[in-house]
């Protein structure tokens, strides 16, 4: 029977920079019951804290909720593991919400094969930022990737596509089924994961364009729709 | 409604025991750090203790270490604080009151006074 | 320890002047925040995070400061502002309150 190993900070997270969850590795536990507390200050202050939420997020995790969560302050934290034989200490983690944003994924991706009557058939998707991101407040940037393959297929073909909230491509193989995702990122934080994959056949008649031809026509399609819109 | 209630003050002798205890509704209680905090007659506020949420961490009033004790039962919804070695200095209104998030004391009960004389 | 200091201990205005009490703390603070009391109840929480007012106080109330020096101001008295006020510290153990303003009627 011992003390209890060295546990380990290993990941933080935030939705939306208005709550955040960390998690642990427990080390060993010495053979003993063994009981894990987050202790942590605000850079700044002295005053320490104990976790306000051990439930939330899981077994060795600690939730922070909004009231618990301070924009522009580093965290500085550490994981206390004791049982009968003595305890042991977490190196310190230093933590700042704005770079620990790890959003949901984008919501309501639809996809459309558009077939305009003058110009090369296109597919076209829109979809939505996650709910828990409010982008009205100018607090967050958020950049999205569009990921696609013909349900067959081992690779994915990857599109960035900046801040717009829709995408067109043009080179695709007709009468394939394609499979298309997208997520997103914030301008300092981590991509989320993948959006539910969204299915879409292509017909057997679309016209296959080239790489090259996809920047070329990609531009006619946005200049030919904003011309439509504001005229 | 958050509300917090005091109770167990009362008149002792120097030298003397008591044990003050604060029963907790309206918040979920086990998330949130808590103090108490006094005031002599006539006289300032005083902080006295304070216990994290899960009793991890544990401050006190250089006026009263080693004398005093706080402690909590999140499955009661309830702090304590119990009072040993008290002295004249000690007699004081002491109120229970709960930090929320990093904003302290936004929420106090009504006080309990405690009296030390003989 | 954080010293707070309140000036003045004591003053005495009349309804609709302009109140501004001081606390100057012996370390500098990131926050400080305010207490209202009035007599033979319990202290309010009034201004917090050196700015904000909680739940209930009047606008005519703001907090400013920053580092060592934080103010509170009444914009124009009224008769149910007449009370004690404390400063109050929670970024260091312990935890200190300065020692009180009284506003008074004149």
């Known amino acids: 029977q011992l003390p209890p190993g060295k546990p380990e900070i290993f990941k933080c997270r935030s939705p939306n920079k208005e709550t955040f969850t960390c998690w642990w590795r427990p080390g060993t536990d010495g053979g003993l019951p063994t009981n894990y507390s987050l202790t942590y200050h605000r850079e700044g202050e002295t005053l320490m804290h104990e976790c306000p939420d051990y439930i939330t997020g899981g077994p060795n995790s600690c939730h922070f909720g909004k009231q618990y969560t301070s924009m522009w302050r580093t965290y500085v934290m550490m994981v206390n593991a004791t049982n009968q034989m003595g305890s042991s200490f977490s190196d310190e983690l230093y933590v700042d919400v704005t770079y620990i944003v790890q959003p949901d994924p984008p919501l309501e991706l639809t996809v459309e094969v558009k077939q305009p009557e003058d110009r090369k058939p296109y597919l076209w998707m829109k979809w939505s930022p996650p709910t828990l991101i409010d982008l009205k407040t100018g607090w967050f940037t958020l950049l999205y990737e569009i990921r696609l393959k013909p349900e067959k297929a081992a690779e994915w073909e990857t599109h960035f596509a900046g801040q717009q909230t829709e995408f067109k491509i043009l080179s695709l193989h007709p009468g394939q089924k394609y499979l298309v995702q997208v997520r997103c990122k914030p301008d300092h934080g981590y991509w989320s994961a993948w959006s539910p994959a969204t299915f879409i056949q292509i017909p057997s008649d679309f016209i296959m364009n080239d790489g090259l031809n996809d920047i070329f026509e990609a531009q006619k399609i946005e200049w030919h729709e904003h011309h439509h819109h504001h005229h | 409604e958050v509300q917090l209630v005091e109770s167990g003050g009362g008149l002792v002798q120097p030298g003397g025991s008591l044990r003050l205890s604060c029963a907790a509704s309206g918040f979920t209680f086990s998330s949130f750090g808590m103090n108490w905090v006094r005031q002599a007659p006539g006289k300032g506020l005083e902080w006295v203790a304070y216990i994290s949420s899960g009793s991890s961490i544990i401050y006190y009033a250089d006026s009263v270490k080693g004398r005093f004790t706080i402690s909590r039962d999140n499955s009661k919804n309830t702090l304590y604080l119990q009072m040993n070695s008290l002295r004249a200095e000690d007699t004081a209104v002491y109120y229970c009151?709960?930090?929320?998030?990093?904003?302290?004391?936004?929420?106090w009960g009504q006080g309990t006074l405690v009296t030390v004389s003989s | 320890d954080i010293q707070m200091t309140q000036s003045p201990s004591s003053l005495s205005a009349s309804v609709g002047d302009r109140v501004t009490i001081t606390c100057r703390a012996s370390?500098?603070?990131?926050?400080l925040h305010w207490y209202q009391q009035k007599p033979g109840k319990a202290p309010k929480l009034w201004i917090y995070?050196?700015?904000k007012l909680a739940s209930g106080v009047p606008s005519r109330f703001s907090g400013s400061g920053s580092g060592n020096d934080y103010t509170l101001t009444i914009s124009s008295l009224q008769p149910e502002d007449f009370a004690t006020y404390y400063c109050f510290q929670g970024s260091g153990y312990p935890l200190t309150f300065g020692q009180g303003t009284k506003v008074e009627i004149k």
């Open positions: 009151t709960r930090f929320y998030g990093y904003i302290p004391f936004d929420y």
């Open positions: 370390s500098s603070l990131i926050y």
């Open positions: 995070d050196t700015s």
